[in-house]
């Protein structure tokens, strides 16, 4: 004979556990229904009545099956140096990512607390290591025979053109100038652009209790210029 299906709330077998999407209520000592994502427990179960769920209130969410008394508060609106890649809904928190040209300078347990602008290497310096979603650009001085005449977070040092007859010798921030005969290059011509990092890292603020209980709001710190380093500019 098939086992009888138990409807919540029910007392579990001694040493047994509750089924999927159920939880054991210590007060009622019963297996009770969890609430689905986007809802929370409005009334907890008793020995004779199951959990009563209700929709999350505006600007709050639950992402998992749960029995929390209040939904979690969505993070603050994204700051001006960020883009909202996921809106706050009843089932998910807002996700903000650093916009192109920025990186996450101060991480936290979930996401990013502070975006900062990618360092730009000034003339005479090129990109040694490109920026990523979580690390800044590293600049290096252009080695002899190479130059960079731009202020850029993507340009590397390029080789001087090789002249049959040099009019003006090149330096770290300027290409060589040849006399009218055609120059050649020691390597491939043209500026080499490193791709901008694509921010995909989740940066939602830490979930905090919904406003009706204790509304702890996470804030994004104000963005200052990136710390100066050799060969970089704050522009």
């Amino acid at each position: 004979l098939p086992a009888q299906v138990a409807f919540t709330p029910y007392a579990p077998e001694p040493g047994g556990t509750c089924r999927l999407r159920e939880y054991y209520d210590q007060t009622a000592q019963m297996c009770c229904s969890k609430c689905p994502p986007g809802q929370h427990a409005k009334v907890f179960c008793t020995k004779t009545s199951d959990t009563v769920c209700d929709s999350c209130e505006d600007s709050t969410y639950t992402q998992l099956w749960n029995w929390v008394p209040e939904c979690l508060s969505c993070g603050s609106r994204c700051s001006s140096d960020q883009v909202e890649t996921q809106a706050c809904t009843r089932e998910q928190n807002r996700i903000c990512t650093c916009r192109p040209g920025w990186y996450c300078a101060l991480s936290k347990q979930e996401g990013c607390r502070l975006c900062a602008q990618l360092r730009k290497c000034r003339p005479g310096f090129g990109v040694a290591r490109p920026g990523t979603e979580t690390s800044d650009v590293v600049c290096k001085p252009c080695a002899p025979g190479t130059f960079s005449n731009t202020t850029s977070s993507t340009d590397i040092c390029r080789p001087h053109q090789i002249c049959h007859v040099v009019a003006i010798p090149g330096n770290a921030s300027m290409d060589a100038v040849c006399t009218s005969t055609s120059p050649t290059r020691s390597m491939a011509p043209g500026a080499v652009h490193l791709p901008q990092p694509v921010s995909t890292r989740s940066q939602h603020t830490q979930p905090t209790p919904a406003p009706s209980t204790a509304p702890g709001t996470s804030f994004l710190l104000p963005v200052g210029p990136s710390p100066p380093a050799e060969g970089s500019t704050g522009d």
């Epitope: 600007s59 406003p211 709001t217």
Partner: antibody, heavy 120, light 108 residues
Framework: QVQLVQSGSELKKPGASVKVSCKAS????????MHWVRQAPGQGLEWMGR????????KHDPKFQDKAVLSSDTSVSTAYLQISSLKAEDTAVYYC?????????????WGQGTLVTVSS | DIQMTQSPSSLSASVGDRVTITCTAS???????LHWYQQKPGKAPKLLIY???NLPSGVPSRFSGSGSGTDFTLTISSLQPEDFATYYC?????????FGQGTKVEIK
Amino acid sequence: QVQLVQSGSELKKPGASVKVSCKASGFNNKDIYMHWVRQAPGQGLEWMGRIDPATGNTKHDPKFQDKAVLSSDTSVSTAYLQISSLKAEDTAVYYCARSPYGDFGAMDYWGQGTLVTVSS
Amino acid sequence: DIQMTQSPSSLSASVGDRVTITCTASSSVSSNYLHWYQQKPGKAPKLLIYSTSNLPSGVPSRFSGSGSGTDFTLTISSLQPEDFATYYCHQYHRSPWTFGQGTKVEIK
């Protein structure tokens, strides 16, 4: 563009009812709340209640719980405010306003207002 | 209910003046849930500042907001002719959601 267009002015006698409409256009009605705010002549703003058009769930200021009925018809993107047992003190401009879910209740678009005058 | 008290109730100022309006809540309000509206005579209110300090697109940068807990401030750094209006703070922290009584900014 986003627009909330309300029905025209109403002149009603005490004890009567009135139904004000607010037609929304230019946005998806799904992830918003529609609020009703009233403003008596020369007075400030008073929040009456709000409706989630997607579910029909409503929330009122207890002061208006028995006075105002909020409803919506998503097929015509319209929210309604019905006020019953009108008294002279219900004379006011009634505004509808929307707040997107997740924007912490900021009412970013408002209707032009509907003047309801209650006089015998 | 959370009571929102604005001060002053009205003020007279000249074009170019710096104007500050305060809003005091009877109990703590999360910064995300505090907004300011501007209303001109015969017109619907307009969202001026959301979540204490954020400006919607199209709102001039002379408007700014600050505060936390129970005390919030709206500042107009240099009053312009089009800024003469009534300003309301609004809390959405706890239902019923409430407005301040308004501050009328008049021409001196």
